[in-house]
């Protein structure tokens, strides 16, 4: 094949080699960019910056080599459009540093930086960590920091990510209240900070205020949906990113629901309880306190991480006719009390049938459902039996 006279020439089915001295000063408009999986660049002393726009359209790129060139700066978001990048060779350029953000989100199997005048500072703590952990082939390169010594020896005691403290209200928060959160950010070289509120949706009206090092957040007219939702403060410096999540507990009265008994391994009377703080529960059977045993007991399902409602069963192990009757679940917290009742018939009384009647072969429970989910005022003298905390 005739030698390729262009600055960049095809290499294999999806590769490109740009090796003609000084032919490039940027990577805009590379031919066939959208299908490239491999890009090799060498001897491009005018190629000094690698920015987001340079690699736009190179979504299939897996191997990028820029060597013996003039690269001085790689933007933190330079590889945003190349998520499949797995090998990155930037050796023998003029890089003094490389941000942790540059490689964040990539699954790099190989990162080559040897032959650059790296300067050891906390901004390279992430690279030192790669060296310590044997990642990306970094240890084999024995990277040196210009004027200082091996990267491995860089002192790092002061190279921490930001420290975050989020202040939440001590006092009880009620539905409709306004809540002020404050995120105090400490640390060296702070760059950016903010709030992540993706879980909040319609739980409150959000107003942000302030900036580094103290960020404010007002949650106005909060609803009970705010419970168990993460409010996250984040901050970044040249070392990395820190996040702290808090939850605001919005008080609301207990509520309860009972459902028709179902036969599973044991019989189950399904229930749902809600409230903040988590209500305590008591069961009544035919109006009297039900003492739980290994045959009749409360069992909770695994709670959902982002909601206060708890689901569970009153489990009955091989109930007989003596267990037929009216089951009431009482739920109470400091803001109110609620109850729900259900009739359950597990088995007919074998001693109450007419000898003339045909003997029944199977039974299905006959339930009548009466639920009063509205909170009622808590009276201290109400007699309660077994107490189960919902946490």
């Amino acid at each position: 094949a005739a030698p390729c006279p262009d600055a960049c020439c095809p290499h294999g089915s999806s590769g490109l080699r740009c090796t003609r001295d000084g032919a490039l000063d940027s990577l805009h408009h590379l031919p066939g960019a959208e299908n490239l999986t491999e890009l090799y660049i060498e001897n491009q002393q005018h190629l000094q910056h690698l920015e987001l726009r340079d690699l736009r359209g190179l979504g299939e790129l897996r191997n990028l080599t820029i060597v013996k060139s003039g690269l001085r700066f790689v933007a933190p978001d330079a590889f945003h459009f190349t998520p499949r990048l797995s090998r990155l060779n930037l050796s023998f350029n003029a890089l003094e540093s490389l941000s942790w953000k540059t490689v964040q989100g990539l699954s790099l199997q190989e990162l080559v930086l040897s032959g650059n005048p790296l300067h050891c500072s906390c901004a390279l703590r992430w690279l030192q960590r790669w060296e310590e952990e044997g990642l990306g082939g970094v240890p084999e390169q024995k990277l040196q920091c210009h004027g200082q010594g091996p990267l491995a020896h860089m002192p790092n005691a002061s190279c921490g990510v930001p420290t975050l403290k989020v202040q939440v209200p001590n006092a009880s928060v009620d539905v409709g209240d306004d809540v002020l959160l404050r995120c105090q950010v400490e640390g060296r070289g702070l760059e950016q900070a903010g709030w992540i509120l993706t879980e909040l949706e319609q739980s409150a009206t959000v107003m942000k205020s302030g900036g580094l090092p103290s960020l404010g957040l007002t949650l106005a007219n909060v609803t009970s949906d705010l419970n168990r939702k993460n409010v996250t403060c984040w901050a970044e410096n040249d070392v990395g990113r820190a996040e702290v999540s808090v939850q605001v507990n919005v008080s609301f009265p207990a509520s309860v629901q009972l459902h028709t008994a179902v036969e599973m391994h044991h019989w189950c009377i399904p229930f749902s309880v809600d409230g903040q703080p988590a209500p305590s529960l008591r069961w009544l059977f035919n109006g009297s306190v039900l003492n739980e045993t290994s045959f009749i007991f409360t069992e909770f399902l695994e709670p959902a991480a982002n909601e206060t409602v708890r689901h569970g069963c009153l489990r009955l192990n091989q109930p007989t006719h003596v267990n037929n009757g009216n089951y009431t679940l009482l739920a109470a917290n400091p803001f109110g009390q609620a109850s729900a009742s259900i009739m359950a018939a597990f088995m007919d009384n074998p001693f109450e049938f007419n000898p003339e009647d045909p003997i029944p072969v199977s039974f299905s429970p006959v339930d009548t459902n009466s639920t009063s989910g509205d909170p009622v005022e808590k009276k201290d003298e109400t007699p309660f039996g077994v107490s189960v905390a919902v946490g």
Partner: antibody, heavy 119, light 106 residues
Framework: QVQLVQSGAEVKKPGASVKVSCKAS????????MHWVRQAPGQGLEWIGT????????SNNQKFKGRATLTADTSTSTAYMELSSLRSEDTAVYYC????????????WGQGTMVTVSS | DIQMTQSPSSLSASVGDRVTITCSAS?????MYWFQQKPGKAPKPWIY???NLASGVPSRFSGSGSGTDYTLTISSLQPEDFATYYC?????????FGGGTKVEIK
Amino acid sequence: QVQLVQSGAEVKKPGASVKVSCKASGYSFTTYWMHWVRQAPGQGLEWIGTIYPGNSDSSNNQKFKGRATLTADTSTSTAYMELSSLRSEDTAVYYCTRFYYEDWYFDVWGQGTMVTVSS
Amino acid sequence: DIQMTQSPSSLSASVGDRVTITCSASSSVSYMYWFQQKPGKAPKPWIYRTSNLASGVPSRFSGSGSGTDYTLTISSLQPEDFATYYCQQYHSYPPTFGGGTKVEIK
């Protein structure tokens, strides 16, 4: 013990060049970066540049780009700093100093070489 | 380049005094280094990585600070402490020095 011994005082005319030497002993010369710092009379300290004798990799303060040349002779464990196109404001004491990476600081300094630029 | 500002540029103190020298960097640095220099002599490393005393430095000296503000403190000034003290950073390239603080006898 680790020692850096520098060449003697020099008097030069403006426009001339001067080459200051720094002989190292007591440690592995090729594995530590050597730096050069100067101090004008009654003034503070100013960094000139650095060289890694192991591979002669070097870099200079932008202020001295093109005028300061750093070299190293590993056979004699000697580092050199040559400053060309001298002017009167280059009159200063020139120091070599080792960057000790185990504790990450300039731990040993030469005694200094006085360079006077005068017509 | 990171600028290093030392204050005061000179101070007069008596033997036994507590002396504090401050160094402010134009942007955040990881560590601060201090050197002592006496007339006609090369600088001597005095405090490295903010708070570590170099070999032979008396325990009356201490260093502290973080971010942009750092301090060298002499708890009880002795006759041999009269000298000029320089701060230096090597967090950012190139290394830069403060203008010096001359500690003189009152």
